[in-house]
């Protein structure tokens, strides 16, 4: 194809006449805005085809693209075409008129688009603005096409100055349909409800502007439809929520509730399910075992924990020896009940720096209008053993006695031992255990007393040694579950002048 003049861009005077010629080896035709304007077609003797387009009395509205293409009825495979762009600077025409569809630009992804505001004069300076603002946007301009770039979801206008007159274009609206892969989350105000209470579920989708929600639920299967409500969460762009509300639940409403979300732009979908349980009446159930005897160590802190599940939320009380406990101002007792999941609770009684007086019978009671449960245990305060006294004496009978007295809770065990070789024992040689055996020539007598007020045991043990022929280190060791204590005394023979 040969076009004269060749272009590709021409600037012509307003009111003038101009002739465009196109020739080729097959029939050719001029096109303007997808139409064929009146033109003269001819075939020369050499077989060359031509078309002459005469533009008369030019105005700014003649500005635009002109194409010459093969008009081939023989079906030759050719898509060759020549493009020419003509400007007719015309002060009476501001921006070239747009088709309505050019003013509305629709996108489903971030992509470059063109805002097609065009002028008749390639020398004019054109700027792009948001409709609401005066600041010119830094977007490149092509006089033949308009502004091209990545645009926000906004409305835009173009501005230019013709002579001393500022001219605005029509507004161009960019609509971006926000779509992304769908990720659904479903939650319920409560997953356990009593019959007669409400079931409320929410299904939320983020990052999509256009979605369809479909709920499946037990009632639907029996043909009893519930109309969900869809809303847009305020202050959260592209957060859409569907709410399914079932008033006055029945036992048959127990089961799986599924929210299925689809968007048709990219044909994405996702679904999530949640289980709802409708109970006839409320309940309180203990979880796990708590032994009927619990222990705490004197002056240490101890937390006693009870785990249970309940619906609706219960009231929790603790008692000691049938008296209600509360948080003490002195900080000696702390009570707390935590909701660790929708229906699971942990109730804790913390005794700070335990005292002997805190031993006793404890009860935790959890209750509401439908049910109650209670759990009781005895708290024993364990006291580490102390050896309070270790003394040696020489009765007239000739034997020698050693007396050991100590206290503790639980009941202490007593162990007697002796070292006969004071130089090597106990470092090199182990002490010898003493007890009720004839070869040791020792006898043991032990008495145990329980002191109610102090809530601990006292152990008094007397060791009788038949004859002592050389100095002897005698050791008394008291032991219980929370500790041990030892004292020793040197026992010397009667014959020696010193004790």
């Amino acid at each position: 194809l040969v076009v004269t003049p060749p272009g590709p861009e021409l600037v012509l005077n307003v009111s003038s006449t101009f002739v465009l010629t196109c020739s080729g080896s097959a029939p050719v035709v001029w096109e303007r805005m997808s139409q064929e304007p009146p033109q003269e077609m001819a075939k020369a003797q050499d077989g060359t085809f031509s078309s002459v387009l005469t533009l008369t009395n030019l105005t700014g509205l003649d500005t635009g693209e002109y194409f010459c293409t093969h008009n081939d009825s023989r079906g030759l495979e050719t898509d060759e075409r020549k493009r020419l762009y003509i400007f007719v600077p015309d002060p009476t025409v501001g921006f070239l008129p747009n088709d309505a569809e050019e003013l509305f630009i629709f996108l489903t992804e971030i992509t470059e688009i063109t805002i097609p505001c065009r002028v008749t004069d390639p020398q004019l300076v054109v700027t792009l603005h948001e409709k609401k603002g005066d600041v010119a946007l830094p977007v490149p301009y092509d006089h033949q096409r308009g502004f091209s770039g990545i645009f926000e979801d906004r409305s835009y206008i173009c501005k230019t100055t013709i002579g001393d007159r500022e001219v605005d274009s029509d507004a161009y609206y960019v609509y971006r349909l926000q779509v992304s892969s769908i990720n659904v989350s479903v939650n319920a105000v409560q997953t356990v409800v009593r019959q007669g209470e409400n079931i409320t579920l929410m299904c939320i989708v983020i990052g999509n502007e256009v979605v369809n929600f479909e709920w499946t639920y037990p009632r639907k299967e029996s043909g009893r439809l519930v109309e969900p409500v869809t809303d847009f969460l305020l202050d959260m762009p592209y957060h859409i929520r569907s709410i399914l509300h079932i008033p006055s639940a029945e036992l048959e409403d127990s089961g799986t509730y599924t929210c299925n979300v689809t968007e048709s732009v990219n044909d994405h979908q996702d679904e999530k399910a949640i289980n709802i349980t409708v109970v006839e009446s409320g309940y309180v159930r203990l979880l796990g075992e708590v032994g009927t005897l619990q222990f705490a160590e004197l002056h240490r802190s101890r937390t006693l924990q009870v785990v249970f599940e309940a619906y609706p939320p219960p009231t929790v009380l603790w008692f000691k020896d049938n008296r209600t406990l509360g948080d003490s101002s002195a900080g000696e007792i702390a009570l707390s009940t935590r909701n660790v999941s929708e229906t699971r609770y942990v109730s804790e009684l913390t005794l700070v720096r335990v005292k002997v007086a805190e031993a006793g019978h404890y009860t935790m009671r959890a209750f509401h209008e439908d049910a109650e449960v209670q759990l009781s245990f005895q708290l024993q305060i364990n006291v580490p053993v102390r050896v309070l006294e270790l003394s040696e004496s020489h009765p007239d009978s000739g034997e020698q006695t050693v007396r050991c007295r100590g206290r503790g809770m639980p009941q202490p065990n007593i162990i007697w031992s002796a070292c006969r070789d004071l130089k090597r024992c106990p470092r090199e040689l182990p002490p010898t255990l003493l007890g009720n055996s004839s070869e040791e020539e020792s006898q043991l007598e032990t008495n145990v007393t329980y002191w109610e007020e102090e809530q601990e045991f006292e152990v008094v043990s007397t060791l009788r040694l038949q004859h002592v022929d050389r100095p002897l280190s005698v050791r008394c060791t008291l032991r219980n579950a929370v500790g041990q204590d030892t004292q020793e005394v040197i026992v010397v023979p009667h014959s020696l002048p010193f004790k």
Epitope: F106, K131, K132, D153, R154, S155, Y173, V174, Y175, R176, L177, E209
Partner: nanobody, 116 residues
């Protein structure tokens, strides 16, 4: 918050007409025009037409000029799009959309299926 809620899915026979509604809430209906757009399976978005909210003026895409009518009812803040002489190629999801100047808002879409 601006919200556009469209009518439900429709199944129509070729040659019939369909009328889709779009109810607006959360803004002054008169302040924004309403566009109608469609998306056929596997295709991009296609603008059909627009109605001015204040005076009811309409603009239609050339392709739909003869077959589409867009109207609005100010009292209920609802816009309507009617497409006549339906053919199988009109099977698509139809959206209403409005522009608030600083962002656009869309209806959830209405699937129209044309099948004999």
């Amino acid at each position: 918050q601006v919200q556009l809620v469209q009518s439900g899915a429709e199944v129509k026979k070729p040659g019939a007409s369909v009328k889709v509604s779009c109810k607006a809430s959360g803004y002054t209906f008169i302040s924004h025009g309403m566009s109608w757009v469609r998306q056929a399976p596997g295709q991009g978005l296609e603008w059909m037409g627009w109605i001015s909210a204040d005076n009811g003026n309409t603009n239609y895409a050339q392709k739909f000029q003869e077959r589409v009518t867009i109207t609005r009812d100010m009292s209920t803040s609802t816009a309507y799009m009617e497409l006549s002489s339906l053919r199988s190629e009109d099977t698509a999801v139809y959206y209403c959309a409005t522009h608030g100047g600083d962002r656009s808002y869309w209806g959830q879409g209405t699937l129209v299926t044309v099948s004999s």
